[in-house]
């Protein structure tokens, strides 16, 4: 509660997560024209990346292009990119949907369909559906540690959210522990009012605020956080904004002389800690 | 404007940024001694990095060190660097300016110039002026989408940029689409008062700055972003305090079971949003 | 000191930072069953990682586990983790310490001791102490500058803490150079009361704090930073709570057509940059 | 579904040399471990050598430094070099892999075997 006799100060904050937990991982794996049931298991190392720490990301899902070299090949087939002849192929146009540079020239896609060749990384990305259930949907079960260090300089006082108290194998719960900073991935979408599972297919932000009302003076003092969860990312969002969460990134390799990459669209959770709050004192 | 009646709070915000365009490069490759023109294109997963929410880098330049492997070699001649004896080679010593430590001993670099020998990443790094005009100067064409999702948690109070009356084929322009939140990276240069073209050869850092000015008073409500842009990186800093905006990174891989890697010095820009702003209410 | 007649504005800051070292790595290397001492020298692209602006890292210790591939072998044999039949083994459990998926079989894990076998990354990682002294201990001789660009726009004023006068070979020092903004990272945790080999073993985190005290009226400007730091993460945390700073990162590679990767538990100091403080005008 | 085929035993010299091969086929996505083992005649059947996904190998001490054992993944295939044969080598050689199923566990699957003949 607003104490107007006190001298209010915002927080300065510092956070570092930690992660855990493991998912295995069936897909259909197309190998040599044959498909098979392929299965994996992804650690920390595989589905997360180190990111500053205020944000930490989960991947949940994704799709790869494997093999990819800089060549000549038609471009995929979306609505409105198939031709007919060359005439409907502009050389040296760069479509912003489309991932190469036209050479003016039609080409066929496959038996059926004909679009315009392009200079990218071939063949180009196939732009198919996240795959639904999402390939790490069991991330759910996973943990996360969260440690903030917080500062009143004007107060000279500082504080974190992991007391010497605590017990390090707690997990967060609103009413039985509310202080306990490990969360399980999908009791924060729970408490946010989230479906884990939906969300996990194209991806998303989610926000753990974590807010200290800090009450510093000797005769009243009181200041511990109050952690509360809310979904970042506009679920009702118009498909040309780009809904969920998703970003590509490539595994760069060589061989026989000629550089390959795999292209990974990767889905996820991006989970940001927005810490707020003042100190006050008399 | 000032609003003394009302209650103040500073806003909570989270930043998503998607990066769209690609790049036709040309530049000399030098392979077995012959130098032809290599050409490629940069997709996004080539150029940009998965970075946290409030800040995004797209590479413009880069200069490539190829083939790297621990051993011994001369070091770069740069000036005050040469040596005519291996008096002038401290066994053991680490010039801050150097890549390598020195073993003592001078040695030649080429027909006419001899430099301290190094134990360090050879052939050491070549410290030549990055390309001019910057390889991926056509990155001025590409586009940003900015979804910014804020929070005045004292007044409950939850909106973002991107409504859902808005087109997602816009481009932002300060007279005509000033809700817009795609935006052409020249385009925010212009607005900046600044030459893309120029800055994408050593790179740089840019801001750009959405403003929350908040009315949340049901009779006079009001809450849209302000977005504006401006240069964070001094372009007329001295040498020695590394002008512009680039980091080193490496892809390392394995070659007759020995280690190498390929360091790349990646000019680009770095945007930094800057959300600020504050909600009032009676 | 508070002027009660004054606007006062929080700041909005931009970082940028440039670490400055390279480190000489001794270490034992195994290959084919004979252990070698190996020497490597490591520099930024190999021990620091881009990350976004007010925040940096500096890996100062590791712990590699190379040539892993995605099979069943035998889990670590951590405490309580040993078998001696194939009832203590739980078909398709996760044990939130292991690294893989049990498949129900007790096999041996070396000549004394059988684990339970998992479906992993294998060989899977051993739970071994980090080195210690670290690996990457000369990091305390690294400097790093820091740049920052501050903005009060309801004041629109700017400022940055290198000015136009400043000499880029100078080193932060409390008294004879308070203003300087290249800072030796020994010297960081000198200040700040800490032991930088100490805490270069399990890694931590380093506030720098820049605070802005900006009186902004002509008749009496001033608006310089002060630097100061303080250690960020918990030294006496227990170690259920993950005390120090690592996360795990993988490099992946093919060999005989199967995927494997060597993945690599980096230690390091995080350093984060806190900017704060007010301008404030009549 | 799953099809183990062994080839490459015969009769051979003491001091001689044999390769044995063995093709997997079917709709394997993962093999994890590879291994021979061998059967005398009245006697129970025993390990000579495996080889797990990532290329490490076990050998009986009776055949160490003798044979090789090695992968092919692209190929489905196992190879086992056996050089300096013994009469005491002489047994039905079997080829044995194994493979992780989510949800199943670990499943085994064996060859038919072929004949090794160590004599003069």
């Known amino acids: 509660s607003d104490k107007l006799y006190q001298r209010k100060e915002p927080v300065i904050s510092s956070v570092h997560t930690k992660v855990k937990g493991i998912a295995e991982v069936t897909e259909n794996v197309t190998e040599g024209g044959v498909t098979k049931l392929g299965h994996s298991i992804f650690d920390t190392a595989d589905y997360t990346f180190p990111l500053q720490g205020n944000s930490f990301f989960v991947m949940t899902n994704y799709v790869k292009s494997e093999g990819q070299v800089q060549t000549l090949c038609p471009e995929y087939p979306r609505r409105g990119a198939q031709c007919s002849s060359d005439r409907r192929c502009k050389k040296g146009w760069m479509d912003p949907q489309s991932k190469g540079i036209q050479t003016g020239r039609c080409v066929p896609y496959d038996k059926t369909r004909k679009t315009c060749e392009v200079s990218a990384w071939c063949p180009t990305e196939e732009e198919k559906e996240a795959p639904r259930p999402a390939l790490l949907r069991s991330a759910e079960n996973f943990t996360v540690l969260i440690k903030n260090n917080i500062h009143f300089p004007g107060h000279n006082y500082t504080t974190r959210n992991i007391l010497p108290t605590m017990n390090g194998s707690c997990t967060f719960h609103k009413t039985w522990d509310p202080q306990c900073s490990i969360f399980r991935l999908g009791d924060i979408f729970q408490e946010a009012g989230e479906n884990f599972t939906e969300v996990a297919v194209q991806g998303g932000i989610m926000g753990i605020e974590i807010y200290w009302d800090c009450n510093l003076d000797s005769w009243s003092h009181h200041c511990r956080p109050r952690y509360s969860f809310r979904r970042l990312d506009d679920k009702n969002m118009d498909e040309s904004f780009v809904p969920g969460y998703n970003f590509r990134y490539a595994k760069y390799y060589k061989e026989n002389n000629v550089e390959k990459r795999t292209l990974i669209k990767a889905f996820g959770i991006r989970f940001d800690i927005l810490v707020f709050g003042t100190g006050g004192k008399f | 404007s000032d609003k003394l009646y009302q209650r103040k709070e500073p806003v909570i915000s989270s930043v998503h940024t998607k990066v769209k365009g690609i790049a036709e490069v040309t530049e000399n490759v030098t392979e077995g001694g012959v130098t032809k023109l290599g050409h490629s294109i940069f997709d996004t997963a080539d150029y940009t990095f998965p970075l946290q929410g409030n800040s995004f880098f797209v590479m413009t330049n880069y200069v490539k060190s190829e083939g790297q492997v621990q051993t011994l070699c001369p070091e770069y001649p740069r000036r005050g660097a040469q040596c005519s004896s291996d008096r002038r080679c401290k066994k053991g010593w680490m010039d801050p300016q150097s890549k390598g430590i020195q073993t003592g001993r001078c040695v030649p670099y080429d027909k006419t110039r001899k430099t301290c020998e190094v134990s360090a990443w050879c052939p050491t790094e070549e410290e030549k002026e990055a390309p001019r005009p910057a390889l991926l100067r056509s990155a001025e064409n590409f586009t940003v989408l900015i979804k910014n999702n804020i929070h005045f948690p004292g007044h409950n109070y939850t909106t973002r940029n991107i409504l859902p009356t808005m087109n997602g084929s816009c481009t932002f322009h300060k007279t005509w689409d000033p809700q817009c939140s795609i935006f052409r990276l020249g385009d925010i240069f212009q607005e900046a008062g600044e030459n893309f073209t120029e800055v994408a050869v050593q790179g740089g850092i840019m801001g750009i700055e959405i403003y929350w000015d908040c009315n949340l008073d049901s009779w006079s409500h009001h809450c849209r972003p302000r977005y504006s842009f401006r240069r964070l990186d001094d372009k007329n800093m001295d040498e020695s305090f590394v002008p512009g905006y680039n980091f080193r990174y490496a892809k390392y891989y394995k070659e007759n079971n020995v280690e190498k890697r390929t360091l790349i010095k990646a000019f680009g820009i770095r945007f930094d949003i800057l959300v600020f702003g504050t909600g009032g209410k009676f | 000191s508070d002027k009660l007649y004054q606007r006062k504005e929080p700041v909005i800051s931009s970082v940028h930072t440039k670490v400055k070292g390279i480190a000489e790595v001794t270490e034992n290397v195994t290959e084919g069953g004979v252990t070698k001492l190996g020497h490597s020298i490591f520099d930024t692209a190999d021990y620091t990682f881009p990350l976004q602006g007010n925040s940096f890292f500096v890996m100062t210790n590791y712990v590699k586990s190379e040539g892993q591939v995605q099979t069943l072998c035998p889990e670590y044999p951590r405490r309580g983790a040993q078998c001696s039949s194939d009832r203590r083994c739980k078909k398709g459990w996760m044990d939130p310490q292991s690294k893989g998926i049990q498949t129900g079989r007790c096999v041996p894990y070396d000549k004394t001791r059988k684990t339970c076998e998992v479906s992993a990354w294998c060989p899977t990682e051993e739970e071994k102490e980090a080195p210690r002294p670290a690996l990457l201990r000369s990091a305390e001789n690294f400097t790093v500058l820091i740049k920052n660009n501050i903005h009060f726009p309801g004041h629109n004023y700017t400022t940055r803490n290198i000015l136009p006068t400043m000499n880029g070979s100078c080193t932060f020092h409390k008294t004879w150079d308070p203003q300087c903004s290249i800072f030796r990272l020994g010297d960081i945790f000198q200040e700040a009361g800490e032991n930088f080999t100490e805490v270069a073993v399990q890694g931590g985190i380093m506030g720098i704090e820049i605070y802005w005290d900006c009186n902004l009226d002509s008749w009496s400007h001033h608006c310089r930073p002060r630097y100061s730091f303080r250690r960020l993460d918990d030294k006496n945390m227990d170690e259920s709570f993950v005390p120090g700073y690592n996360f795990r990162y993988a490099k992946y590679y093919k060999e005989n057509n199967v995927e494997k990767r060597t993945l690599i538990k980096a230690f390091g100091i995080r350093f984060d940059i806190l900017v704060f403080g007010t301008g404030g005008k009549f | 579904e799953v099809q183990l085929v062994e080839s490459g035993g015969g009769l051979v010299q003491p001091g001689g040399s044999l390769r044995l091969s063995c093709v997997v086929s079917?709709?394997?996505?993962?093999?994890?471990?590879m291994g021979w083992y061998r059967q005398a005649p009245g006697k129970q059947r025993e390990l000579v050598a495996t080889?797990?996904?990532?290329?490490?190998?076990n050998y009986a001490d009776s055949v160490k430094g003798r044979f090789t054992i090695g992968r092919d993944n692209a190929k489905n295939t196992v190879y086992l070099q056996m050089n300096s044969l013994k009469p005491a080598d002489t047994a039905v050689y079997y080829c044995?892999?194994?493979?992780?199923?989510?949800?199943?566990?670990?499943?085994?699957?064996w060859g038919r075997g072929t004949q090794v003949t160590v004599s003069s």
């Open positions: 080889v797990t996904r990532g290329d490490i190998t």
């Open positions: 079917g709709s394997m996505y993962r093999i994890d471990n």
């Open positions: 044995n892999i194994d493979s992780y199923i989510i949800g199943a566990g670990v499943r085994d699957y």
